[in-house]
């Protein structure tokens, strides 16, 4: 049977390779039954996760799942790092797996790598 607990479906050890200067939406897939929970994003700093209070967020509703979205408009080099979403549900705190953003600063890259290059040559992300 379907669980009626809130579930956050960020994939474990997930990663995104993105370019500074581009817009990006980081999605937290949320499953809930009745009342939509209060969801927040935080950014990991060592073992603590610092709540992102003043960032633009929005909800996207689909048939079987909803997405709580953190907007990067645009992506900045210091957006590099790991993020986690969490939900308050019936006075329980549910935390997602963390997801990591690898930001390439295009100003420091000699040329903008294509998506195919980034997929086949991941070391481009670290130069």
């Amino acid at each position: 049977k379907e669980s009626c607990d809130v579930q956050l479906y960020i994939k474990r050890q997930s990663e995104h390779s993105i370019l500074a200067g581009d817009p990006f939406e980081l999605e937290c897939p949320v499953k809930y039954c009745a009342n939509r929970p209060h969801v927040t994003w935080c950014k990991l700093n060592g073992t603590t996760c610092v709540k992102l209070e003043d960032r633009q967020t929005s909800w996207k509703e689909e048939k079987n799942i909803s997405f709580f979205i953190l907007h990067f408009e645009p992506v900045l080099p210091n957006d590099n790092g790991s993020y986690r979403c969490s939900a308050n549900f019936q006075s329980n705190l549910i935390e997602s797996h963390s997801t990591t953003l690898y930001v390439t600063d295009v100003k420091s890259a000699s040329e903008r790598p294509s998506k195919d290059e980034m997929a086949s040559r991941p070391w481009l992300l670290y130069r």
């Epitope: 479906y9 994939k11 474990r12 050890q13 997930s14 797996h97 998506k115 997929a119």
Partner: antibody
Framework: EVQLQQSGADLVKPGASVKLSCTAS????????VHWVKQRPEQGLEWIGR????????KFDPKFQGKATITADTSSNTANLQISSLTSEDTAVYYC????????????WGQGTTLTVSS | EVVMTQTPLTLSVTIGQSASISCKSS???????????LNWFLQRPGQSPKRLMH???KLDSGVPDRFTGSGSGTDFTLKISGVEAEDLGVYYC?????????FGGGTKLETK
């Protein structure tokens, strides 16, 4: 019913490249990771790597980096493993494996594709 | 990489007898999320591997409760209480805590 259907057995010549496919039914591969596992004749299992079909991000065992390429096409719900510069060492059964919502738990296995490299 | 060492290589049992397989990792498999990503798989002759156990001790659906998984850190054990003919094959442990993910070398369970 959740299923992973892999492409049929392949016989290829040394030095060539080959692309193996894995088509999912009963779930959306965007919601999972798809892994590839190698098993040489009468040998154990080796994890090659995995793809996140939602964004194309891949991870590999370093020994397969540069040798294997993993791609995914979410419109056809298919993941692919391409192996280049084939040698007899690449003769093996290759399995695609998915895990539910990227849980890293290797839930569902395809039936395997037998690849034979021979001149 | 994390090395997974399984013992014994081969286990010869009489049907109905109990069996125990050991799996040791070269470092602790406890992840930062508090979970231990250690699975057990069975590969019967001519078939794809099938997961029996995940997160050390969680039995997969359809797997009989004669299978039990235990352990923590670097030492793990799969026990079968009363081996049946359908249990014969090669057992693999696997770690999904660290990249690259790695399998143990396998333990062949056969009849005497």
């Amino acid at each position: 019913e959740v299923q992973l259907q892999q492409s049929g057995a392949d016989l290829v010549k040394p030095g060539a490249s080959v692309k193996l496919s894995c088509t999912a039914s009963g779930f959306n591969i965007k919601d999972t990771y798809v892994h590839w596992v190698k098993q040489r004749p009468e040998q154990g299992l080796e994890w090659i790597g995995r793809i996140d079909p939602a964004n194309g991000h891949t991870k590999f065992d370093p020994k397969f980096q540069g040798k294997a390429t993993i791609t995914a096409d979410t419109s056809s719900n298919t993941a692919n493993l391409q192996i280049s510069s084939l040698t007899s060492e690449d003769t093996a059964v290759y399995y695609c494996v998915s895990d539910y919502y990227g849980s890293s738990l290797l839930d569902y296995w395809g039936q395997g594709t037998t690849l034979t490299v021979s001149s | 990489e994390v090395v997974m060492t399984q013992t014994p290589l081969t286990l010869s049992v009489t049907i109905g007898q109990s069996a125990s397989i050991s799996c040791k990792s070269s470092q602790s498999l406890l992840d930062s999320d508090g979970k231990t990503y250690l699975n057990w798989f069975l590969q019967r002759p001519g078939q794809s591997p099938k997961r029996l156990m995940h997160l050390v001790s969680k039995l997969d659906s359809g797997v009989p409760d004669r299978f039990t998984g235990s352990g923590s850190g670097t030492d793990f054990t799969l026990k079968i209480s009363g081996v049946e003919a359908e249990d014969l094959g090669v057992y693999y442990c696997w770690q999904g805590t660290y990249f690259p993910y790695t399998f143990g070398g396998g333990t062949k369970l056969e009849t005497k």
